[in-house]
């Protein structure tokens, strides 16, 4: 129809100008469209320069929409991480404060002379929780060994106890069980509780990290062309009122976000494992019960040592020989009264239950984040047509969209009619993030069984790759032991984004 050839470009001028582009580019009326490289080559209101500007703009708008969606998810994960971290740190800090307040009165010099050893233990526990590559069982064993040496010397000031005698004492210690059942109980419970707490918080950190890194993956040129066609070609072709057909939009975005959808399986596995590990937060070996009650095990241990002092001394002398008596030394230390114990089971505060139920709900809500992303962006950002009728924009004209909707993920885009996707070239950043999810899931599964995956001889994640940028200070490289200097693989992730809490000045 010759009349339609000279249609005015007023509506396009308005839209183009509103986007901040110069109106001098816009023709007054439609022109022939042989110059168009993305949009169908009918009569058009777009010059080559306009087409290029709108293509760049549509690309940027999709990246912004993608980042916005990711930011919401990241913010949720960061809030969860902060809440749980605050709670776990609070439990440990509370325990240490209780120890500092009650032990001087309960144990006198047996505590004050060893305050540094107790402070160090809490620092080590804090570091372990925050992702330092230290062996918790070894750290606890070393604490008890050092404490035994010091307390034995204090309880026997009348004896000369040179280093070689103390070395012998250390070798006898395991058989003598000087602190009763407390060290074993604390080791079993603390290992399970701290492993569960730290792996859960690490899981939140890794999930957040993955979302952040994936949001930075650039969209390829084929995607840019398809999005331009989806969003702005209708304007160029003189049907600015036509909204994209829903299935057309889904195919474009499934093609654009094919690699992202491949995160789905491992993302679900990670979130499932995180929900599962929260079961370990309850009961007598649960996080709240154990982390908040470290001081009660320590009190029990010192009481046991005092109660067993005479038997212990006899056995040590039997194994290590008679130590020399210091002629000017005082008599043996008076037996102190037993330190009063707080009840071992902390009554649950309700805070953790609330945190866990919120976390479970939110983690379930975002389980299908990656595969629902195309649909979400289409419905929230693309001003879709309300129905798949013949009045929507199908990429060529106003009309019905006939192709079927593609499946999710890279492999399913082989016949995507809207985006040319090379299914043989997966995005490497996203593959690395899939590996990070796998490693973290493996860590959570081990933690569920009470094992610290970083200190198992045969780590089955098979990979040391990954960003590793979650490490604080030099936590990930450090080993703590004066008896051994192991060289196990450092953590791939410590806890990202947590505040420094060690290395504080004290006087």
């Amino acid at each position: 129809d010759p009349a339609s050839k000279s249609r005015s470009c007023g509506e396009v001028r308005q839209i183009y100008g509103a986007k901040g582009f110069s109106l001098s580019d816009v023709p007054q009326a439609e022109i022939s469209g042989e110059h168009l490289r993305i949009c169908p080559q009918g009569y058009t209101c777009c010059t080559s320069e306009m087409e290029e500007n709108l293509a760049n703009r549509s690309h940027a708008e999709l990246e912004t929409a993608l980042r916005d969606s990711s930011r919401v998810l990241q913010a949720m994960l960061a809030t969860q991480l902060r809440s749980f971290d605050d709670h776990f740190q609070h439990l440990l800090n509370d325990s240490e404060r209780t120890l500092q307040a009650t032990f001087p009165g309960a144990f006198g010099e047996l505590y004050t002379q060893n305050a540094r050893a107790f402070r160090d233990l809490y620092s080590e526990l804090r570091l372990y929780y925050r992702g330092a590559n230290l062996h918790l069982e070894e750290t606890l064993a070393e604490f008890w060994a050092r404490l035994l040496e010091r307390l034995f010397k204090q309880l026997h000031p009348q004896l000369l106890l040179p280093d070689d005698y103390l070395d012998c004492l250390g070798k006898q210690a395991e058989a003598l069980r000087p602190f009763g059942e407390a060290p074993r109980e604390l080791r079993l419970r603390a290992t399970r509780a701290f492993v569960a707490a730290r792996s859960f918080v690490q899981g939140l950190g890794v999930a957040s990290d993955v979302v952040r890194k994936v949001a930075q993956v650039p969209l390829g040129p084929e995607c840019s062309r398809a999005v331009m066609k989806l969003v702005y070609c209708a304007h160029c072709l003189g049907v600015p009122g036509a909204r994209p057909c829903p299935d057309y939009c889904r195919n474009v975005l499934k093609g654009c976000l094919a690699n992202q959808a491949d995160l789905d399986a491992e993302w679900r596995n990670l979130l499932d494992s995180m929900v599962l590990i929260t079961d370990k937060f309850w009961g007598t070996s649960g996080v709240e019960s154990v982390i908040g009650s470290v001081h009660t095990w320590l009190a029990e241990a010192i009481n046991a040592l005092q109660d067993n002092r005479d038997t212990l001394t006899a056995k040590v002398i039997q194994g290590c020989g008679n130590p020399k008596v210091n002629p000017q030394g005082p008599g043996p230390e008076e037996k102190r009264r037993r330190g009063k114990l707080a009840p071992r089971e902390r009554p649950p505060s309700g805070t953790l239950e609330k945190l866990v139920s919120e976390a479970k709900a939110q983690l379930r809500d975002v389980q299908d984040f990656w595969i629902s992303l195309p649909g979400t962006l289409c419905s929230e950002k693309m001003a879709l047509s309300t129905a798949s009728d013949d009045r929507c924009w199908n990429g060529m004209a106003r009309g019905r969209y006939l192709p079927e909707v593609m499946g999710d993920g890279l492999a399913n885009q082989i016949n995507n009619p809207e985006v040319e996707v090379d299914i043989t070239k997966p995005d490497m950043t996203i593959r690395q993030q899939i590996m990070q999810l796998k490693i973290m899931t493996n860590r959570l599964r081990s933690a569920y069984n009470g094992n610290d995956v970083d200190f198992q001889d045969a780590s089955d994640d098979g990979s040391g790759s990954g960003s590793g940028d979650g490490c604080l200070d030099d936590l990930c490289s450090r080993k703590v032991s004066r008896k051994s200097s192991s060289s196990r693989t450092p953590l791939t992730h410590a806890l990202p984004g947590l505040s420094e809490q060690e290395g504080q000045k004290t006087s």
Partner: antibody
Framework: QVQLVQSGAEVKKPGASVKVSCKAS????????MHWVRQAPGQGLEWMGE????????TYNQKFKARVTMTRDTSTSTVYMELSSLRSEDTAVYYC????????????WGQGTLVTVSS | EIVMTQSPSSLSASVGDRVTISCRTS??????LNWYQQKPGKAPKLLIY???NLKTGVPSRFSGSGSGTSFTLTISSLQPDDFATYYC?????????FGQGTKVEIK
């Protein structure tokens, strides 16, 4: 065998800062506290503070608390002592010293670092 | 802080002499007292820890005794290598403190 090797002598102006290093070898670095002790010319020994190389926790002598910072780098088994707002009376030999076992007894000493503060 | 007082501040003695150095503390430190030897231009060396334990490798002519607030370092037969300054130090509490030193000179 245990060795503590300190950085070389320094000459500083009043008001400046100095950072002395102490590289440890021959034992598990994170297993023992490290202390800093100084000795002014012709004077006695003065304890400045300690650091736990495992955790980075520090305890300072109140006298130096506002001016001293002790840090460690576990990757190089090195501890550092930084003293700021130097004055002429800070001219001294600064020693790092490692504990014998967990006991506050200084069994191993660095060779010392002479810091001279002069305008 | 615990104040450490050594006496004498210096002494002159001959090879073969028996030498005793005293260290007193401003409060009880039980047996947490250590002795160091320092030669000019060198770092101190640990001799005795926990009041009376001889560090491995230190000659047996050195001995230590005492408890509470009063301690003694004894060199049973002074040797040429023993002319140096000796310091006591408490490891009972923080801040760690040293005595002012006792210089042992050749008579």
């Amino acid at each position: 065998q245990v060795q503590l090797v300190q950085s070389g002598a320094e000459v500083k102006k009043p008001g400046a800062s100095v950072k002395v290093s102490c590289k440890a070898s021959g034992y598990t670095f994170t297993g023992y506290y490290m202390h800093w002790v100084r000795q002014a010319p012709g004077q006695g020994l003065e304890w400045m503070g300690e650091i736990n190389p495992s955790t980075g926790d520090t305890t300072y002598n109140q006298k130096f608390k506002a001016r001293v910072t002790m840090t460690r780098d576990t990757s190089t088994s090195t501890v550092y002592m930084e003293l700021s707002s130097l004055r002429s009376e800070d001219t001294a030999v600064y020693y790092c010293a490692r504990e014998k076992r967990d006991d506050g007894v200084f069994a191993y000493w660095g060779q010392g670092t002479l810091v001279t503060v002069s305008s | 802080e615990i104040v450490m007082t050594q006496s004498p501040s210096s002494l002159s003695a001959s090879v073969g002499d028996r030498v005793t150095i005293s260290c007193r503390t401003s409060q009880t430190i039980r047996h947490y007292l250590n002795w160091y030897q320092q030669k000019p231009g060198k770092a101190p060396k640990l001799l005795i820890y926990d009041a009376s334990n001889l560090k491995t490798g230190v000659p047996s002519r050195f001995s230590g005794s005492g408890s509470g607030t009063s301690f003694t370092l004894t060199i049973s037969s002074l040797q040429p290598d023993d002319f140096a300054t000796y310091y006591c130090q408490q490891s009972y509490s923080t801040p760690r403190t040293f005595g002012q030193g006792t210089k042992v000179e050749i008579k």
